[in-house]
């Protein structure tokens, strides 16, 4: 049903869903701090633009009695329950920030008349693609898929002269929310990734993964998995690995690889890590000092959600346009705004664009080094290290199928 919005007469409210079930196990207090820091910045920016208005956030908490798993598995109805609560209290703001779980976002989008914008720190799944009033501020699965297909096809770099068309995907069901949906997208038979590959098999058991590492009859040399180095070590340990195996470790929200004193463990030598380019000032920022690298990105997405709202509010107010209109609800896309840590670009469907970074372990220095970067906005690869000190033969990535000749 239509809910009146607290969104006029110089007073603009943001509804922030503080859900018990969240994409990342982040204390709600930290998210509140991120939102409040964002509000301070927005107020300053509006004031500097000569706009004398009030911007506040209302934090809507779930009672946590029914939906208490803490992860996203029981989030489907929690979002709707919170919306009902907002509806009953007649307290809808101009914009809704949260939820972060794909299940809840999908359900909320499906079951409500969305005449207001929804900003999510998460909602990674393909089912949340192409939603007209949904903006996602953490890289969704679709972006990962486009990178992987682009990289698989690449055969014109001195370190990658074979096009790949095969892959194993390791997915054992214990993944974090982001990894769950990333791997889910790769597994889906109708996805772009599956469509572009000739062979793809999902490995669900640890033993399956371990056996592939030395199996002479394996159908692909490439294995995609999602998580951090520790996750890989638990699975792989110090087992021998065939020389032409390439493990692609998707670990987008982890800037530890870029810290100066980090040395890559030996078990990472056959691994290419896909992560996001780290922010410039985040490591020392006030709101992120107590956060782990993953949680920094999650809290940052909440903060940037506030800044995005401020950006749109400023534009509409300067143009003398109404905020409580479908036009406003549909405007949170195809734009670049000044985020907490520099410009943030949203694509035509409101999904954040980013620079993905592919790292390798240098056999010389035992350090993580940047192999290439990939701009998701233009789907373009930028090679960085043209002569990487790989573990693989001839400093080239191997063919994806053992014994297949040059291409």
């Amino acid at each position: 049903s239509q809910v009146s919005q607290n969104c006029h007469n110089g007073s603009y409210e943001i509804s922030v869903l503080m859900m018990g079930n969240s994409a990342f196990a982040e204390p709600l207090k930290n998210l509140e701090d991120a939102v409040n820091e964002g509000l301070e910045i927005v107020r300053g920016r509006l004031q500097n633009a000569g706009l004398n208005v009030t911007v506040n956030a209302t934090f809507m908490y779930s009672d946590g009695l029914i939906h208490n798993s803490g992860d996203c598995r029981s989030s489907t109805c929690e979002g709707l329950d919170l919306l009902r609560k907002i509806s009953n209290a007649q307290r809808m703001g101009c914009v809704l920030i949260g939820p972060s779980c794909t299940y809840s976002t999908f359900q909320m989008y499906l079951d409500t008349e969305l005449s207001y914008p929804m900003i999510s720190a998460g909602s990674f799944g393909l089912s949340c693609d192409y939603k007209e009033t949904l903006t996602r501020l953490m890289s969704p699965a679709r972006k990962l898929m486009y990178f992987l297909v682009n990289f698989w096809k690449t055969n014109d770099l001195p370190f990658k002269t074979y096009s790949w068309s095969t892959s194993y995907v390791y997915k054992n069901g214990t993944e974090t929310e982001d990894c769950f949906w990333y791997l889910n997208a790769l597994e889906a038979s109708v996805s772009y990734f599956s469509h572009e590959l000739g062979f793809k098999v999902v490995l669900r058991q640890d033993k399956e993964f371990q056996d592939i590492l030395m199996d002479h009859n394996r159908k692909s040399n490439v294995i995609i998995m999602c998580g951090g180095p520790e996750f890989l070590y638990k699975l792989k340990g110090d087992r021998a690995v065939a020389e032409d195996i390439v493990i692609i470790l998707v670990d987008l929200f982890n800037d530890q690889y870029f810290e100066d004193n980090v040395t890559a463990p030996d078990y990472m030598k056959n691994v290419l890590v896909l992560t996001l380019s780290p922010g410039n000032s985040l490591l020392n920022s006030s709101f992120s000092r107590n956060l782990s690298p993953t949680k920094r990105d999650f809290a940052l997405a909440y903060l940037n959600g506030i800044l995005l709202f401020g950006h749109m509010l400023k534009i509409f107010l300067e143009n003398g346009e109404n905020i409580t209109t479908p036009k406003f609800a549909h405007a949170f896309r195809n734009l670049t705004f000044e985020g907490y840590d520099g410009p943030v670009t949203l694509d035509d469907w409101g999904d954040v664009d980013s620079t993905m970074v592919l790292l390798y372990t240098s056999v010389d220095t035992k350090k993580y080094k940047v192999l290439l970067t990939y701009d998701t906005h233009v789907n373009k690869t930028y090679p960085v290290d043209m002569s990487p000190t790989f573990t693989w033969k001839n400093s080239k990535l191997p063919n994806d199928i053992t014994g297949r000749g040059p291409q």
Partner: antibody
């Protein structure tokens, strides 16, 4: 419009060093690798090395590893190549060339002539 | 290093002629790149990834080939096409150039 403007011609004595600059404009300097290429009189083009301005990664052609040192100043959008212990065979035109993968070397500087003569 | 051998080294032709330049690689490469250079000027990107014309290159130019043999073809030579053409590979590190083919007016 993309432009790579190199420093002027240099005449050096054997044993000396020379530093050639290449100022980039018309694009984001840190987005693209910068290559250096040598063209000695009557010789084929020779690739010397490449630098990624964003991460500072440098790859040298083994042949020029002890001859050339590539650096950059990102704030000035400028790449540099220093040639040391100059000899007569270092007499050549040196070019910087932007890498715009998949079109390698898509824009070239106008070249800097280095003459080594006693 | 991969060696690139261009043939011919010199080529005399008249405007309107069809001209073919060949580049042979000492081992197989996936793609070939071509550059045009005029006297006193720096090289210009001409053809990349074997057959893609660089920006501003006329459609009378074409590139083809695979493995170790690649060609640049000018379907109808124009006065402004008289220059030296170089092939280049980046399949293996380091990238290497051919010795050049000088196209002169007959």
């Amino acid at each position: 419009e993309v432009q790579l403007v190199q420093s002027g011609a240099e005449v050096k004595k054997p044993g000396a060093s020379v530093k050639v600059s290449c100022k980039a404009s018309g694009y984001t300097f840190t987005d693209h690798n910068m290559n250096w290429v040598k063209q000695a009189p009557g010789q084929r083009l020779e690739w010397m090395g490449v630098m990624n301005p964003k991460f500072g990664t440098i790859n040298y052609n083994q042949k020029f590893k002890d001859k050339a040192t590539i650096t950059r100043d990102t704030s000035a959008s400028t790449a540099y190549m220093e040639l040391s212990s100059l000899r007569s065979e270092d007499t050549a035109v040196y070019y910087c060339a932007r890498d715009n993968y998949p079109n390698y070397f898509d824009y070239w500087g106008q070249g800097t002539t280095v003459t080594v003569s006693s | 290093d991969i060696q690139l051998t261009q043939s011919p080294s010199f080529l005399s032709a008249s405007p309107g002629d069809r001209v073919t330049i060949t580049c042979s690689a000492s081992s197989s490469v996936n793609y070939m790149y071509w550059y045009q250079q005029k006297p006193g000027s720096s090289p210009k990107s001409w053809i990349y990834r074997t057959s893609n014309l660089a920006q501003g290159v006329p459609s009378r130019f074409s590139g083809s080939g695979s493995g170790t043999e690649y060609t640049l073809t000018i379907s109808s030579l124009q006065p402004e096409d008289f220059a030296t053409y170089y092939c280049q590979q980046y399949h293996d590190y380091p990238p290497t150039f051919g010795g050049g083919t000088k196209v002169e007016i007959k």
